[in-house]
């Protein structure tokens, strides 16, 4: 019969920090040089050997003369209470294959932390512990006086926990969270009464939990070095060093080699120049409590992030082409490029793609003359495409060519005695057609009557009129705009002998706040278009006038513009060029975009007055500087008598006042009778103009007392 | 009984440096930090810093870093604060004060000052 | 200036309940418990309330605290003459790393 091989020589020590127990022991009565698989069974008991408070197996071989070790963790700070800790064990070898039974226990050794020493009453554990965020805590405090009466508290407000022993009370914290990088408090005080014997605290330091590093990548930029980069994530660093911000290490499983990062979310890698293609990183972010890791597997050659090309220049730039040169960091033989070519200017942009060796070029063509064109270009690895490069670019400026479109003319024809006076008028070309600074306009006018005469005016920019002063001929006016190139295309308008001013009628209409809406009949004959022109109706010509080309099929027109004022007149003329470019005008327009109400009251004065009328008359108003139409007149009347004149009928002031009032509906009547009236009567007036708008300002009533019947005025 | 005795008055040129002391007793001085607080007359208190006599870890307000050092003699129960560099509105009452809480811990946490020392005059002059 | 603020007095008759309020942000009283002192001429601060509304041995229920999110006040009942001196809180400061004390509240006794 085997003896039993009791477990002997049972040593425990303690690891405060970690909260674990180390146990150490031999068997005895192994046989000499025989192995053994056995399994121990340990009991781990607190405060007192019969609190049984963890049980378990621990299997292992055991040789002769060998000494075993087992740890085991503790929820509870070991300060917060005595353990006891005993083993027994079993033989489970299939070389003994009958029945086994387990030795007797070991005597109990007794582990007991001493933390509680000196004349203090009131002791916290564990001190300075370190967590993760989310995890479970156990705290305890240890009271040397039953009679006290302790509360705790978690960052000011008070805790809860579960009493062991008269002196000994412990608090499970549930998934901890973090506050702050320099911990989290925890305070006791024992107090007798409502007098305090003492606080004591212990410093809870809470760590962020470790992220895996996300956007783990690596590339080189020339065969040397591979930079590698990652989003690190929280920052999981305690206040005092408690615990650092997490380290970063680099393992490439091929080579074996390993490097220590110095920057939390890059590190570069020495590539060694023993044609290794292929690397197997594993980047390894690891904190005192915790080690995360992420891998990549990758070609060299397919992960190249190129520097950005240099020497960006233009050579042979004319007003319409320019061919772009580049350079890029040649970093291996043979290698292709796939550039990319961004042009920018006039508010577009084009892009090109070419494949080049060593040094780029790429002829641009269709640009737009005196342009600033802004192009950059970027490269990549045209046989595996990992990322492009980042952008050089420079400003380069077409020449100027000839302005390509005659100028936009029109005219304004006076008839003075024996001669004409044109206004001539031309807007200026816009950047696509005038190709460059616009430098000057030449007008040539030539007699038709007698071709052999003309004239040339050099008209220096920006100026965009000039007055020519004809006599009773036909002419042929061209305005050419020039640059430091050459001259646009002639713009030409034919001023025809005749007066063109014949008598048409001028007609009313209503505009909107989109502008106005223009229609008209169209001339007989052939026509190569029309043209609307306009202006403010009070101001002179030359300060506000403005002009449209209509096509020749069309017979309607919107003009709209931001420069329609309300309570402003403007009027139109509609002209049908002829197939000879002259002009004949067709139709006048006038109106507001929108009309105000009047802004002034006639100044009204008081002829004839007898004991029985007076005649009211404002023969001075003029109608037409209004801010719209004047359709006619209200005269406002107040006397004694209960019943209003004949004509007038009751109104209502706006102060409420009542009085009478008489209409007048033709705006060119400008005088009034007001008769049936009694001798030595008081009465007052008030006129106001009208427009579909509303009356003029109120104002104040004018006095009149009509004289007795015997006096004469 | 528990109580903090400081050193007497002190009078300094600018540019000089003090060094003021805290005497601890009534109760074991490495069990509770040691704060700093300053009061210019007419003024508030200001505070200045800690230090944990078990560790010796120290802890200063942004204002007084690198111009400030606390250090302590735990075999006299002693706590010094040191501060050079002095200028005239460094003028001031000095006081230590002990927190409230004796705290188990080799860092800091602040629970409140439950005993304070007399205080100290400094006054830098010319 | 302070990083807590307190109004730089309050008054009130012997009997009545005084209010001092201190309001700060939530890197400090926000998120720290908070802490009274008062100071009579010439002497060193005492401390009256710790833990936003616990007293030390020797202070009188007449002295309590209270806080709410960034602010807390200390209330002062049945006032006495003896009380008449200068009050301040005080907290920690996650953002500055260190105590903040607020300006003081100097207390007349009318």
């Known amino acids: 019969e085997r003896l039993p091989l009791t477990p002997v020589s049972l040593k425990v020590s303690t690891n405060s920090t970690r909260q674990s127990l180390h146990l150490q022991w031999t068997v005895h009565n192994l046989p000499y040089h025989q192995e053994l698989k056995m399994v121990f069974q340990i009991q781990i008991s607190r405060i007192e050997t019969s609190n049984v408070i963890w049980v378990g197996n621990y299997s292992t071989t055991v040789k002769w003369n060998q000494v075993l070790h087992w740890s085991w963790e503790s929820e509870l700070p070991l300060e917060c209470a005595t353990h006891f800790v005993r083993i027994k064990s079993l033989v489970d070898d299939a070389k003994f294959p009958e029945p086994n039974f387990w030795s007797n226990w070991s005597s109990w050794e007794e582990v007991s932390v001493q933390d509680s020493t000196g004349q203090d009453i009131l002791f916290v554990f564990p001190k300075d512990k370190l967590v993760e965020e989310g995890t479970n805590v156990t705290i305890c405090y240890v009271s040397r006086n039953i009679q006290n009466n302790v509360s705790c508290y978690l960052e000011g407000k008070q805790i809860h926990g579960e009493q062991l022993d008269p002196h000994v009370t412990a608090f499970n914290l549930n998934s901890v969270p973090f506050i702050r990088n320099k911990g989290t408090n925890i305070y006791c005080e024992a107090s007798q009464g409502n007098v305090s014997e003492g606080m004591k605290g212990i410093v809870l330091f809470v760590s962020k939990v470790l992220e895996e590093p996300k956007d783990f990548s690596c590339e080189t930029e020339d065969f040397k070095t591979l930079h590698c980069t990652w989003d690190p994530g929280t920052d999981t660093a305690l206040g005092w060093s408690k615990q650092p911000s997490q380290s970063y290490t680099l393992f490439e499983s091929f080579s074996g080699e390993k490097k220590l990062c110095t920057h939390k979310n890059w590190c570069n890698w020495q590539i060694t120049q023993d044609s290794q293609e292929t690397y197997n990183f594993t980047l390894i972010a690891e904190n005192y409590l915790r080690k995360r890791s992420v891998n990549i597997l990758f070609n060299l050659t397919h992960r190249v992030y190129l520097m950005n090309p240099f020497s960006v220049n233009f050579e042979n730039v004319n007003a319409t082409n320019a061919i772009m040169t580049w350079k890029v960091h040649s970093i291996r033989n043979n290698f292709t490029y796939l550039c990319q070519i961004e042009l920018h200017g006039e508010g577009k942009m084009m892009q090109y793609n070419v494949s080049i060796k060593v040094n780029g070029e790429y002829f641009l063509s269709e640009l737009e003359p005196a342009t600033e064109y802004m192009a950059r270009v970027r490269c990549a690895d045209a046989s595996h495409f990992w990322k492009w490069s980042e952008w050089s670019g420079q400003n380069f400026t077409t020449l100027e060519a000839a302005p390509s479109e005659a100028p936009d003319v029109w005219r304004i024809v006076s008839l003075e005695p024996g001669n004409h006076t044109v206004t001539l008028f031309w807007k200026p070309l816009s950047k696509l057609h005038a190709n460059g600074k616009i430098l000057f306009y030449n007008v040539v006018v030539e007699n038709l009557d007698k071709p052999s005469s003309s004239e040339l005016h050099s008209i220096p920019a920006p100026a965009n009129s000039t007055k020519l002063i004809l006599d009773r001929c036909s002419y042929q006016i061209c305005v050419i705009a020039n640059n430091s190139v050459g001259a646009s295309p002639a713009s030409v308008i034919v001023i025809s002998a005749d007066p063109e001013n014949k008598e048409v009628e001028e007609e009313r209409i209503a505009g909107t706040e989109g502008g106005f809406s223009l229609s008209w009949k169209p001339q007989p004959g052939d026509v190569i278009g029309y043209v609307v022109d306009w202006c403010d109706h009070t101001q002179d010509v030359l300060g506000d006038f403005q002009w449209k080309n209509v096509g020749p099929n069309t017979t309607s027109t919107v003009i709209s513009t931001d420069a329609f004022r309300p309570g402003v007149r403007y009027d139109f003329r509609i002209y049908g060029l002829s197939t000879k470019r002259i002009a004949c005008l067709l139709e006048k327009k006038t109106g507001y975009s929108q009309e105000l109400a009047p802004s002034d009251n006639p100044h009204v004065l008081v002829d004839t007055l007898t004991s029985h009328s007076f005649t009211l008359s404002w023969k001075d108003y003029s109608t037409e500087s209004q801010p719209g139409f004047i359709q006619g007149y209200h005269v406002y009347l107040k006397s004694k008598a209960r019943q209003c004149h004949p004509r007038f009928e009751k109104a209502v002031l706006s102060d409420g006042s009542e009085c009478c009032k008489y209409k007048i509906d033709n705006p060119e009547e400008k005088a009034l009778i007001v008769d049936n009236l009694k001798p030595e009567s008081f009465y007052e007036f008030f006129i106001t103009p009208f427009t579909s708008a509303g009356e003029g300002p109120s104002a104040t009533f004018t006095k009149v007392t009509t004289p007795d019947e015997h006096s004469s005025m | 009984q528990v109580q903090l005795v400081q050193s007497g008055a002190e009078v300094k040129k600018p540019g000089a440096s003090v060094k003021v002391s805290c005497k601890a007793s009534g109760y074991t001085f490495t069990s509770y930090e040691i704060n700093w607080v300053r009061q210019a007359t007419g003024q508030g208190l200001e505070w200045m810093g800690w230090?944990?006599?078990?560790?010796?870890?120290?802890g200063y307000a942004q204002k007084f870093q690198g111009r400030v050092t606390m250090t302590r003699n735990t075999s006299i129960s002693t706590a010094y604060m040191e501060m050079s560099s002095l200028r005239s509105e460094d003028t001031a009452v000095y006081y230590c004060a002990r927190d409230i809480v004796a705290a188990n811990t080799d860092y800091y946490f602040y629970y409140g000052m439950d005993v304070w020392g007399q205080g100290t005059t400094v006054t830098v002059s010319s | 200036q302070s990083v807590l603020t307190q109004p730089p007095s309050a008054s009130g008759t012997p009997g009545q309940r005084v209010t001092i309020s201190c309001s700060g942000s939530?890197?400090?009283?926000?998120?720290?418990?908070v802490n009274w002192y008062h100071q009579l001429p010439g002497t060193a601060p005492k401390l009256l309330i710790y833990n936003i509304n616990k007293r030390p041995s020797g202070v009188p229920d007449r002295f309590s605290g209270s806080k709410s999110g960034s602010s807390a006040s200390l209330a002062i009942s049945g006032l006495q003459s003896e009380d008449e001196a200068d009050y301040y809180c005080?907290?920690?400061?996650?953002?500055?790393?260190?105590?903040?004390f607020g300006g003081g509240t100097k207390l007349t006794v009318l």
């Open positions: 005080s907290t920690w400061d996650d953002s500055l790393d260190g105590v903040v």
């Open positions: 230090m944990n006599p078990n560790s010796g870890y120290t």
């Open positions: 939530n890197s400090n009283i926000g998120s720290n418990t």
